[in-house]
Interface confidence: low
C-alpha cells in the first residue's frame, strides 16, 4: 500500500525518499515518475539523477534536498488538483532486480478560503524543506511516525544533524514523532 | 547573471564577533549551497562553512564552536558569525556559490577583516 | 578531513610552455567532486574545472583536469601571459570542504 501525503493547491507538495549512498560521491541512479513503480524503470518520468548530477527534470518538479548525501526527495511546486496520484520513486541500484521502489500517494486539498491559524499542520506541511546536508559522517537510521515498515535503514538521513534541526521542530510542532537511533 | 557581495566592518577587536553578509543578486538564493571561505594574508583558501537556503548548515570542524552563518531568503542574503575572534582570524572573506555538483562557481570579491585593537 | 598536499609550490614557466600541476589527496576523492580554481593577486578565485575534468564556462580549452582517486592533474597546454596565477584544487565531496595549498604559477 502506498504512504499518503497531502498538499492544498497552491502549495508545494513534499513527496519523501532516501538512500544512502555507500560513501561520498558514490550516487546510484534514481528515477521519479507519475504513477505506480512498473516491473523497471518508471513510467511518466518527471525526474532522473544519474551517478553524477540530475540530468532530467520538468516544470515544477525538483530535489531540494542533497541528492549527492541520498536525499531524493521530489518537491512539487504550485500544485494543482491534477498533481494527485501515485508517484514512485525508484533507486536504481546495480544488479538484477535489486531496485528499491517506493510508490507514495500524493492528496492534493482544496485551497482553504479562510486558513485559520493552527499549529497543527499536515505531514507534508512539517516538511515543507527537509534537512539538506551534504551529509558526511555515520548515517542513522530514523523512523518517521507516519512512516509503514518499510526498511529504512535505505531511506536514512543523519540523525546526529536532526537533532537540532528546523525539521524536528517542525515534527514536534506538527505532532508527528520521529525516534533516533 | 547572479552576484555575490560581501559587506561588514573591516575591523573587529579581539574577543568581539565578527559578522558579516553577503547579499545575493540577479538571481534567487534558492536551491544551492552558500558558503563562506576564508584567506589569511599571504595563505592559501580555508572553507568556513556553508548554509543551504532551507537552513541546514554544514561548518568546518574546527571553527564550528565559533561560527554560525544564517540566511534570510526574504532578503537575498546569508551572514557569517564568527565569535570571539583574535588576529589569527585577520583575512580576506569571500562568499561563493555552490551547486552542488559543480563546485564554488560564483564567488564575491572578497572584503578585508583585520582583528585589532 | 581529507588532505590536499599541491606541487610543485612554485612553477616557472614561459608564455607559450605547457604547465601540468599536481594534486594529491590524502584518501580517495570522488572525481565528481574534485574541483580548481584561479587566483590573481587581489582577486577573488575562479573556478577553472568541476568533476575533475570538466571546463567551467567561459574557461578556455587550454585549461583541461585529469586524474581519479587520490591523483589529480590540471594542465594548461599552451600558458598566456593572464594565466600566470596561484591554483587551487578543492575536493567538495566529504565534510570539511579543503583546498589544497596551491601553486603559483610565475613568468621565468
Known amino acids: 500500500s502506498e504512504v499518503e501525503y497531502r498538499a492544498e493547491v497552491g502549495q508545494n507538495a513534499y513527496l519523501p525518499c532516501f538512500y544512502t549512498p555507500a560513501a561520498p560521491g558514490n550516487l546510484v541512479p534514481v528515477c521519479w515518475g507519475k504513477g505506480a513503480c512498473p516491473v523497471f524503470e518508471c513510467g511518466n518520468v518527471v525526474l532522473r539523477t544519474d551517478e553524477r548530477d540530475v540530468n532530467y527534470w520538468t516544470s515544477r518538479y525538483w530535489l531540494n534536498g542533497d541528492f549527492r548525501k541520498g536525499d531524493v526527495s521530489l518537491t512539487i511546486e504550485n500544485v494543482t488538483l491534477a498533481d494527485s496520484g501515485i508517484y514512485c520513486c525508484r533507486i536504481q541500484i546495480p544488479g538484477i532486480m535489486n531496485d528499491e521502489k517506493f510508490n507514495l500517494k500524493l492528496v492534493i486539498k482544496p485551497a482553504k478560503v479562510t486558513p485559520a491559524p493552527t499549529r497543527q499542520r499536515d505531514f507534508t506541511a512539517a516538511f515543507p524543506r527537509m534537512l539538506t546536508t551534504r551529509g558526511h559522517g555515520p548515517a542513522e537510521t530514523q523512523t518517521l511516525g507516519s512512516l509503514p515498515d518499510i526498511n529504512l535503514t535505505q531511506i536514512s538521513t543523519l540523525a546526529n544533524e536532526l537533532r537540532d534541526s528546523r525539521l524536528a521542530n517542525d515534527l514536534r510542532d506538527s505532532g508527528a514523532t520521529i525516534r533516533i537511533g | 547573471q547572479v552576484q555575490l557581495q560581501e559587506s561588514g566592518p573591516g575591523l573587529v577587536k579581539p574577543s568581539e564577533t565578527l559578522s558579516l553578509t553577503c547579499t545575493v543578486s540577479?538571481?534567487?538564493?534558492?536551491?544551492?549551497?552558500w558558503n563562506w571561505i576564508r584567506q589569511p594574508p599571504g595563505k592559501g583558501l580555508e572553507w568556513i562553512g556553508y548554509?543551504?537556503?532551507?537552513?541546514?548548515?554544514n561548518y568546518n570542524s574546527s571553527l564550528k564552536s565559533r561560527v554560525t552563518i544564517s540566511v534570510d531568503t526574504s532578503k537575498n542574503q546569508f551572514s557569517l558569525k564568527l565569535s570571539s575572534v583574535t588576529a589569527a582570524d585577520t583575512a580576506v572573506y569571500y562568499c561563493?556559490?555552490?551547486?552542488?555538483?559543480?563546485?564554488?562557481?560564483?564567488w564575491g570579491q572578497g572584503t578585508t577583516v583585520t582583528v585589532s585593537s | 578531513e581529507i588532505v590536499l598536499t599541491q606541487s610543485p609550490g612554485t612553477l616557472s614557466l614561459s608564455p607559450g610552455e605547457r604547465a601540468t600541476l599536481s594534486c594529491r589527496a590524502s584518501?580517495?576523492?570522488?572525481?565528481?567532486?574534485l574541483a580548481w580554481y584561479q587566483q590573481k593577486p587581489g582577486q577573488a578565485p575562479r573556478l577553472l574545472i568541476y568533476?575533475?575534468?570538466s571546463r567551467a564556462t567561459g574557461i578556455p580549452d587550454r585549461f583541461s583536469g585529469s586524474g581519479s582517486g587520490t591523483d589529480f592533474t590540471l594542465t594548461i597546454s599552451r600558458l598566456e601571459p593572464e594565466d600566470f596565477a596561484v591554483y587551487y584544487c578543492?575536493?567538495?565531496?566529504?565534510?570539511?570542504?579543503?583546498f589544497g595549498g596551491g601553486t603559483k604559477v610565475e613568468i621565468k
Open positions: 561563493a556559490r555552490d551547486t552542488g555538483y559543480y563546485g564554488m562557481d560564483i
Open positions: 540577479g538571481g534567487s538564493i534558492s536551491r544551492h549551497y
Open positions: 548554509i543551504h537556503y532551507s537552513g541546514s548548515t
Open positions: 584518501q580517495s576523492v570522488s572525481s565528481s567532486y
Open positions: 568533476g575533475a575534468s
Open positions: 578543492q575536493q567538495y565531496g566529504s565534510s570539511p570542504l579543503t
